[in-house]
């Protein structure tokens, strides 16, 4: 319904980089790493290590690249189809809950229980009952026993967006 | 959770300029672009106009091009929307909202969040 800007009215500063290439949209979408134009006719690419799309789309802009924050490691760089992978440091964690910031994982397990899951960069140190085998969620208890944890070894990539 | 604060509207006269500005909190304001949107009484939302996360890039309907201006102060978490030329049929409830991007059809995409909106009445 709304006729949009096209690259012609936009100032020098906001038309696209020459290296921005551009492809025509396939029934009024665009491939990944691309975004439509403000006049639908074209597909612009996104700028490599600043934003990206993951999907065919008719969004008006990239999406920004995520930043690893300090804590966090950056397992992959930003492509202009694929957002930055993050993981936190060795020995924190990132919950699911507070997906925000890594947390530093437990050095050991409360009196009366286990050690049956090392720390990994998306879950605690995993602590049961000795005698009930039951999980352990509570907060790091006042007092630990001697039984610590090593830092776990990567498995899986936890990429936030954002 | 991002908080939009907005100020700025209020009554002019049909011809003249208002400009209104929204402030962000809560999270990186430079992760976001920015869309202003529109509902005047009885009326479906409308989109108004949008900016990228970096500024670079806009976007403004066909209903206002050439009069109204969408911008961006990364430094001061802020967008605006400068309005000039208005006519009478401008008259709505204005409110800004944040996206990761928004499609032409003004749809927000990912997580958005919206300010609690501003009255322009323009009086002919």
């Known amino acids: 319904e709304s006729a949009l800007i096209t690259q012609q009215d936009l100032a020098p500063q906001q038309r696209a980089a020459p290296q921005q290439k551009r492809s025509s949209p396939s029934e009024g979408l665009c491939p990944p790493g691309h975004h439509i134009s403000e006049d639908g006719r074209d597909c612009i690419s996104c700028k490599y290590g600043q934003d990206y799309s993951t999907h065919w789309n008719d969004l008006l802009f990239c999406l920004r690249c995520t930043r690893c924050d300090s804590g966090e490691v950056e397992l992959s760089p930003c492509t202009t189809t694929r957002n930055t992978v993050c993981q936190c440091e060795e020995g924190t964690f990132r919950e699911e809950d507070s997906p925000e910031m890594c947390r530093k994982c437990r050095t050991g397990c409360p009196r009366g229980m286990v050690k049956v899951g090392d720390c990994t960069p998306w879950s605690d140190i995993e602590c049961v009952h000795k005698e009930s085998g039951t999980k352990h969620s509570g907060e790091v208890p006042a007092v630990e026993e001697t039984v610590t944890s090593s830092p776990g070894t990567p498995a899986s990539p936890c990429s936030l967006s954002g | 959770q991002v908080q939009l604060v907005q100020s700025g509207g209020g009554l002019a006269q049909a011809g003249g300029s208002l400009r209104l500005s929204c402030v962000a909190s809560?999270?990186?304001?430079?992760?976001?672009?920015m869309g202003w949107f529109r509902q005047a009484p009885g009326k479906e939302r409308e989109f108004v106009a949008a900016?990228?996360?970096?500024?670079?890039?806009?976007y403004h309907a066909d209903s206002v091009k050439g009069r109204f201006t969408i911008s961006r102060d990364n430094a001061k978490d802020s967008v605006y929307l400068q309005m000039t030329k208005l006519k009478p049929e401008d008259t709505a409830d204005y409110y800004c909202?944040?996206?990761?991007?928004?499609?032409?059809?003004?749809?927000?995409?990912?997580?958005?969040?919206w300010g609690q909106g501003t009255q322009v009445t323009v009086s002919s």
């Open positions: 909202a944040s996206a990761e991007s928004f499609s032409r059809g003004g749809l927000p995409y990912g997580m958005n969040y």
């Open positions: 809560g999270r990186t304001f430079t992760n976001y672009a």
């Open positions: 900016i990228n996360w970096s500024g670079d890039s806009t």
